[in-house]
Interface confidence: medium
C-alpha cells in the first residue's frame, strides 16, 4: 500500500478574530512535495486553489491565502487539503474565522492570537462552531 498522506494543518495570521476591513492570511501546511494547496470554505464545494507552494521547513511545505479586506461574508469555517501527486489528502480540521466591527479603541486588541488546527489536534471544543453556515449546492465557487 502506498504511504498515507499526513493530514494538513491550517492557521490564520494575525488571528481568527479579524476587524472588518482588516486583512487575514490563511496558512496551509503539509509535507514536502505538495503540488497544490486548496483552501475550502464550509465544504469541499467552495474553494480556492494555489500552486504557489513554498518550503516552510525541511519536512514541510506551505501556501498562504490572503484576504486583503475582510467582509462580514468572509466569516465562517475554513479548512485545507492538498494534492501530492497522485493523491489528494484528507482535510485539515476546521478553523473558524470571526469578523468583528472595528472598535477603534486604543485598549482594544484587533485580533486574538493566531489559531491553528493541525494533524495531532482533536477538534476544538468550541460551541460556537454549531452555527456553521450551510453551503448547500455550491459548486467550486471562489472564496473571495
Amino acid at each position: 500500500q502506498e504511504e498515507d498522506l499526513p493530514r494538513p494543518s491550517i492557521s490564520a495570521e494575525p488571528g481568527t478574530v479579524i476587524p472588518l476591513g482588516s486583512h487575514v492570511t490563511f496558512v496551509c501546511r503539509g509535507p514536502v512535495g505538495v503540488q497544490t494547496f486548496r483552501l475550502e470554505r464550509d465544504s469541499r464545494s467552495t474553494y480556492n486553489d494555489t500552486e504557489d507552494v513554498s518550503q516552510a521547513s525541511p519536512s514541510e511545505s506551505e501556501a498562504r491565502f490572503r484576504i486583503d479586506s475582510v467582509r462580514e461574508g468572509n466569516a465562517g469555517l475554513y479548512r485545507c487539503i492538498y494534492y501530492k501527486p497522485p493523491k489528494w489528502s484528507e482535510q485539515s480540521d476546521y478553523l473558524e474565522l470571526l469578523v468583528k466591527e472595528s472598535s477603534g479603541g486604543p485598549d482594544s486588541p484587533d485580533t486574538e492570537p493566531g489559531s491553528s488546527a493541525g494533524p495531532t489536534q482533536r477538534p476544538s471544543d468550541n460551541s460556537h462552531n454549531e452555527h456553521a453556515p450551510a453551503s448547500q449546492g455550491l459548486k467550486a465557487e471562489h472564496l473571495y
Epitope: 493530514r7 493523491k87 489528494w88 484528507e90
Partner: antibody
C-alpha cells in the same frame, strides 16, 4: 445521479470469510470521499465498522473490527469490505455510505440499500 | 475509544407534541455530529450535520443543537411520519482518535 450499492451478501458458515463490494456511480473517488461501512444486526442499531478516504488511502476502523475486517479500495469505483472468522454475531445488513459532497463536517448523506450477510451452519 | 451515549432508548409522544433526544460524546468532537432517521427496512436518512445544520429537504421541525460534548435533536409538531428510530453519529475521522461511532438509537413512537 450519484449512488452507491453494496453486493456480495450471502449465507456463510461460522469461521468462514466473505468479501462485500461497494460500487459507486455518478461520482469520482479522485475527489476524496470517506467511503464507510456500517452494519445493522436484525432489530438492532447501526454499528460503524470503518472508512477509507478514497484519495489519500487512509483507513479508519472501529476498534472491534480491527484485524478481522479489512477495507480496501479495489478500483476507481469500488471499495471492498473483507470479513473473516465470521460468527453468528456478524449476521447483519451491511451498508456502504459516502460522506457529503456539499456539506462540511463529513456526514454520510449517500447510503446504499444494504446487503444481507447471514452466518449460520 | 470514542463512545456516543444516546438517551432515551424509546419515547412516545402524541401527534403535535415535542420529542427531545440527547447524545453525549465521551470526548470533544467539535461539531462533527450528524443525526439520522431510519424507518424499518430502509437505509438511514441524514437529517442534521455539523451538529445544527439542516440537510436539504428536511423539515425545519427538526432542530439540532450543541453544548460542549452534549448534542440534542428536537422534533416539534410531531407527525405520524416521524415515527422512526433516530441515531446520532460522530463524523470525524482523525489522527488523534477515531470517530464514526453511532449512538444506540432512539425509537420514536407517535401516538
Amino acid at each position: 445521479e450519484q449512488s452507491v450499492e453494496e453486493s456480495g451478501g450471502d449465507l456463510v458458515k461460522p469461521e468462514g470469510s466473505l468479501t462485500l463490494t461497494c460500487t459507486a456511480s455518478g461520482f469520482s473517488f479522485s475527489s476524496g470521499y470517506y467511503m464507510c461501512w456500517v452494519r445493522q444486526a436484525p432489530g438492532k442499531g447501526l454499528e460503524w465498522i470503518g472508512c477509507i478516504h478514497s484519495s489519500s488511502g487512509n483507513i479508519y476502523y472501529a476498534s472491534w473490527a480491527k484485524g478481522r475486517f479489512t477495507i480496501s479500495k479495489t478500483s476507481s469505483t469500488t471499495v471492498d469490505l473483507q470479513l473473516t472468522s465470521l460468527t453468528a454475531a456478524d449476521t447483519a445488513t451491511y451498508f456502504c455510505a459516502r460522506d457529503s459532497e456539499v456539506y462540511g463536517w463529513n456526514p454520510n448523506d449517500l447510503w446504499g440499500p444494504g446487503t444481507l450477510v447471514t452466518v449460520s451452519s | 475509544e470514542l463512545d456516543m451515549t444516546q438517551t432515551p432508548a424509546s419515547v412516545s409522544e402524541p401527534v403535535g407534541g415535542t420529542v427531545t433526544i440527547k447524545c453525549q460524546a465521551s470526548q470533544s468532537i467539535s461539531s462533527y455530529l450528524a443525526w439520522y432517521q431510519q424507518k424499518p427496512g430502509q437505509r438511514p436518512k441524514l437529517l442534521i450535520y455539523g451538529a445544527s445544520n439542516l440537510a436539504s429537504g428536511v423539515s425545519s421541525r427538526f432542530k439540532g443543537s450543541r453544548s460542549g460534548t452534549q448534542f440534542t435533536l428536537t422534533i416539534t409538531d410531531l407527525e405520524c411520519d416521524d415515527a422512526a428510530t433516530y441515531y446520532c453519529q460522530c463524523s470525524y475521522y482523525g489522527n488523534s482518535y477515531v470517530g464514526g461511532a453511532f449512538g444506540g438509537g432512539t425509537e420514536v413512537v407517535v401516538k
